[in-house]
């Protein structure tokens, strides 16, 4: 059965929009006017995991790109990345933990938990320009809300 | 309550087809997954299939090309047909809900139907 | 199409502590499930997600799901315990069911 997609983009909760960064990376930084056209859109598809009424566990790849964000052990420590898959067997209903994330609705914002890794959260620095990372900690220095926009198809 | 009433014949002879039907009461028929299992006497289960309720299906490989699940949503039910049995058919086959809620898994199962292929 | 392996059976007294194990290739990377199964019954879900317990499935159940291995852990098992267990999950888009552990409550 195919699984349900939608494409959107990300900015978190100071603005700041998520654009490539060489080849396997995402970076965080302002853009406006014309420059808006670099930033990524994702290809969201809800998958299994755990769900609720606030609570919605997604995939988050890259729209027309067989790079999906997933989250590893790197020496020892929870990591987020961009992994390369084969696309005739991505996106499906159920992935592999690792690229699941637990997208979490408070507030009009959105907050998105590894499953693989949990309290572990999609984050932006305060800095400009920045990777975006995996981080362990919520309602410190490092972002963790963010809005979504719907791109049409 | 959700509760899977299912029903079908028992006794097939070989080379016929085996048709059984799953009746849904109770919770929203189109927020799941429909799903079919069976289990040999004294052995494990084995995955047969899945539909949803716009009649897209899954089929466990191994059977896919002897297998139609398919979907009456007015009624709230689900069929499986599997053709050209065997003795290796024999088996209670139960039919399940894969429920969102619990992470696509199987959170109510039918009561079970002894189908026994013998000639 | 992986496998999922059991074994066949555990032994437990009252009141202690049973574990069945579930492997299988990346098996962690996978989401585990858990269902019992009575004699004469249909299965029952007792963990989903690793190790989440449907509403109405006792406290005593629990799992773990990391590396290989996926385990249901009984603590303080009861007689009523006494079951076949099955763990599952899912590979190339299909579900996968272990062999099934008979666990014996002595």
């Known amino acids: 059965a195919p699984v349900r997609s939608l494409n959107c983009t990300l900015r978190d909760s100071q603005q700041k929009s998520l654009v490539m960064s060489g080849p396997y990376e995402l970076k965080a930084l302002h853009l406006q006017g014309q420059d808006m056209e670099q930033q990524v859109v994702f290809s969201m598809s809800f998958v299994q995991g755990e769900e609720s009424n606030d609570k919605i566990p997604v995939a988050l790849g890259l729209k027309e790109k067989n790079l999906y964000l997933s989250c590893v052990l790197k020496d020892d420590k929870p990591t987020l990345q961009l992994e390369s898959v084969d696309p005739k067997n991505y996106p499906k209903k159920k992935m592999e933990k690792r690229f699941v994330f637990n997208k979490i609705e408070i507030n009009n914002k959105l907050e998105f938990e590894s499953a693989q890794f949990p309290n572990w959260y999609i984050s932006t620095s305060q800095a400009e320009n920045m990777p975006v990372f995996l981080g362990g900690t919520k309602g410190g220095q490092d972002i963790t809300d963010f809005t979504m926009q719907f791109v049409s198809s | 309550q959700v509760q899977l009433q299912q029903w079908g014949a028992g006794l097939l002879k070989p080379s016929e087809t085996l048709s059984l039907t799953c009746a849904v009461y109770?919770?929203?028929?189109?927020?799941?997954?429909w799903s079919w299992i069976r289990q040999p006497p004294g052995k494990g289960l084995e995955w047969i299939g899945e539909?949803?309720?716009?009649?897209?299906?899954n089929y466990n490989p191994s059977l896919k090309s002897r297998v139609t699940i398919s979907v009456d949503t007015s009624r709230n039910q689900f069929s499986l047909s599997l053709s050209s049995v065997t003795a290796a058919d024999t088996a209670v086959y139960y039919c399940?809900?894969?429920?969102?809620?619990?992470?696509?898994?199987?959170?109510?199962w039918g009561q079970g139907t002894l189908v026994t292929v013998s000639s | 199409q992986s496998v999922l392996t059991q074994p066949p059976s555990v032994s437990v007294s009252p009141g202690q502590t049973a574990s069945i194990t579930c492997s299988g290739d990346?098996?962690?990377?996978?989401?585990a499930f858990w269902y019992q199964q009575k004699p004469g019954q249909s299965p029952v879900l007792v963990i989903y997600?690793?190790?989440k317990r449907p509403s109405g499935i006792p406290e005593r159940f629990s799992g773990s799901n990391s590396g290989n291995t996926a385990t249901l852990t009984i603590s303080g098992t009861q007689a009523l315990d006494e079951a076949d267990y099955y763990c599952?999950?899912?590979?190339?888009?299909?579900?996968?069911f272990g062999g099934g552990t008979k666990l014996t409550v002595l």
């Open positions: 399940a809900r894969a429920s969102p809620s619990s992470g696509w898994t199987l959170d109510y």
């Open positions: 109770g919770g929203s028929f189109s927020d799941y997954y």
């Open positions: 539909i949803d309720h716009s009649g897209s299906t």
């Open positions: 990346k098996l962690g990377d996978k989401f």
């Open positions: 997600l690793d190790n």
């Open positions: 599952q999950a899912w590979d190339s888009n299909i579900e996968v």
